[in-house]
């Protein structure tokens, strides 16, 4: 039961995380205009990975896509790449993990196959989460660097009468969404890897060994049956060990509505 719960929870957490990574990647608010210690402007600037937007006091919002590829900063390209890799890996991970779920039966899939698939999806989720966290962190670092550079520029080179206000950008909502989503995907991946350990069959081979005792004849036969001693009323063979790593939660049961995520 614990393995199914761990696997299911890992899947759900990863699903939420990947949805968050996709949302963060698509969001326009990766960086937002810093309003602190800034002259009160009637326009609010914010930027995403794919376009920059301006919201006027009038309510009119204008967004312009970054139509150039070569003209964009290398760091922005790197962040885009990390986020896309994270999404792709996460999506593949989700696909794999669906088939790996214990509550979903596909033909006569071996437990070892499910364990391998669970491990694969877990690793994919971990890498996906790390990609997202790395991408968001690179962007955040870029913002911090630019923020202090623009702050320095604000207080220098103002010898002339006319002042130009430097627009400074700070962390946008997408960064926090990305960090949380990346973390969730990572946690989900770790949970899948933990679940995999519980799913993996323990390869234990019990060879047939015949012991000839001087008094009573006690034979241990392969196939999981304990032979009776030949004495007394206990003449039925009782199945006490099956040789496989089958746990109690693997007992056949009809799937409930909670089994499907």
């Amino acid at each position: 039961m614990a393995v199914t719960a761990c696997q299911g929870l890992g899947f759900v957490v990863s699903l939420i995380g990947i949805a968050g990574i996709i949302a963060a990647t698509c969001m326009d608010q990766w960086s937002t205009q810093d309003l602190y210690n800034n002259p009160v402007t009637a326009v609010f600037n914010y930027q995403g990975l794919w376009r920059s937007c301006v919201r006027e006091s009038s309510g009119f919002t204008e967004c312009r896509g970054y139509f150039t590829l070569l003209g964009l900063p290398a760091m922005l390209q790197a962040v885009r790449a990390l986020m896309i890799v994270g999404i792709v890996l996460g999506a593949i991970g989700l696909l794999v993990s669906i088939f790996a779920l214990k509550c979903i039966r596909i033909g006569s899939m071996e437990d070892s196959a499910k364990a391998n698939m669970t491990l694969t999806s877990g690793i994919m989720f971990i890498v996906s989460g790390l990609c997202a966290i790395a991408g968001v962190s690179v962007f955040a670092n870029m913002l911090v660097t630019n923020f202090w550079m623009s702050t320095a520029n604000m207080y220098t080179g103002m010898g002339g009468m006319v002042q130009t206000v430097q627009t400074r950008y700070t962390f946008g909502a997408a960064l926090f969404v990305g960090w949380v989503a990346g973390g969730l995907t990572l946690i989900g991946g770790v949970m899948m890897c933990i679940a995999c350990r519980g799913l993996a069959p323990e390869e234990t081979n019990y060879k047939a060994v015949s012991y000839h005792a001087s008094g009573h004849s006690v034979a241990y036969k392969p196939g999981g049956f304990k032979a009776s001693t030949g004495f007394g009323s206990n003449t039925k063979n009782k199945k006490i060990y099956d040789g496989g790593a089958r746990t109690e939660d693997e007992v056949q049961s009809y799937p409930s509505k909670h089994d499907y995520v």
Epitope: V43, S57, R64, T164
Partner: antibody, heavy 118, light 113 residues
Framework: QIQLVQSGPELKKPGETVKISCKAS????????MNWVKQAPGKGLKWMGW????????TYADDFKGRFAFSSETSARTAYLQINNLKNEDMATYFC???????????WGQGTLVTVSS | DIVMTQYPSFLTVTTGEKVTMSCKSS????????????LTWYQQKPGQPPKLLIY???TRESGVPDRFAGSGSGTDFTLTISSVQAEDLAIYYC?????????FGSGTKLEVK
């Protein structure tokens, strides 16, 4: 078409209060902020501030903080300018105007003349 | 507050003539986010409310004759009337729409001979 109709001229004594209305039609009232502009006789235009008709939040120019209050009533599609404790220098024509592209004042009311005389 | 300086204060021209008036702001009105200048031009005829002519420094409001043209960027802006008509007799105001408060210029009074 968009129209802003302001209340009629007002004759007030110093120290009194005046409330000017600006009724909007031809658009969704809460979609555009309402600005107020003062024009003293023979003088230029002076931006007083604006009210976000969706949130009710107001922004005032420094010269118009204190005695001046903007308000709006969505159901009546009307914005209001209230001036308390009227002074002689408040004698002017007051215009309401909606915010448009580029934060411009796109549509204007006909103006309300407020006369302050003892 | 942003100071908007308009010059000249008065302009007397003949019908059909080209006229240019200027507006200078104490700070740049260019927004780096969309590369637009938040400067607006209005026309106020005697006894009437102002009328929007140009926003974003150079975008003509619908219904405004194409003889009116706005130009400039940053701190220096110009309104040009390519061929003045008798009905253009008015005061022209520029306005900063980037920083609060939205200050107006003192106006340029255009008289047609």
């Amino acid at each position: 078409q968009i129209q802003l109709v302001q209340s009629g001229p007002e004759l007030k004594k110093p120290g009194e209060t005046v409330k000017i209305s600006c009724k909007a039609s031809g658009y969704t009232f809460t979609n555009y902020g309402m600005n107020w502009v003062k024009q003293a006789p023979g003088k230029g235009l002076k931006w007083m501030g604006w009210i976000n008709t969706y949130t009710g939040e107001s922004t005032y120019a420094d010269d118009f903080k204190g005695r001046f209050a903007f308000s709006s009533e969505t159901s009546a599609r009307t914005a209001y300018l209230q001036i308390n404790n009227l002074k002689n220098e408040d004698m002017a024509t007051y215009f309401c105007a909606t915010l448009g592209y580029g934060n411009s004042l796109a549509y204007w009311g006909q103006g309300t003349l407020v006369t302050v005389s003892s | 507050d942003i100071v908007m300086t308009q010059y000249p204060s008065f302009l007397t021209v003949t019908t059909g003539e080209k006229v240019t008036m200027s507006c200078k702001s104490s700070q740049s009105l260019l927004n780096s986010g969309n590369q637009r200048n938040y400067l607006t031009w209005y026309q106020q005829k005697p006894g009437q409310p102002p009328k929007l002519l140009i926003y974003w420094a150079s975008t003509r409001e619908s219904g405004v004759p194409d003889r009116f043209a706005g130009s400039g960027s940053g701190t220096d802006f110009t309104l040009t009337i390519s061929s003045v008509q008798a009905e253009d007799l008015a005061i022209y105001y520029c306005q900063n729409n980037y920083f609060y408060p939205f200050t107006f210029g003192s106006g340029t009074k255009l008289e047609v001979k």
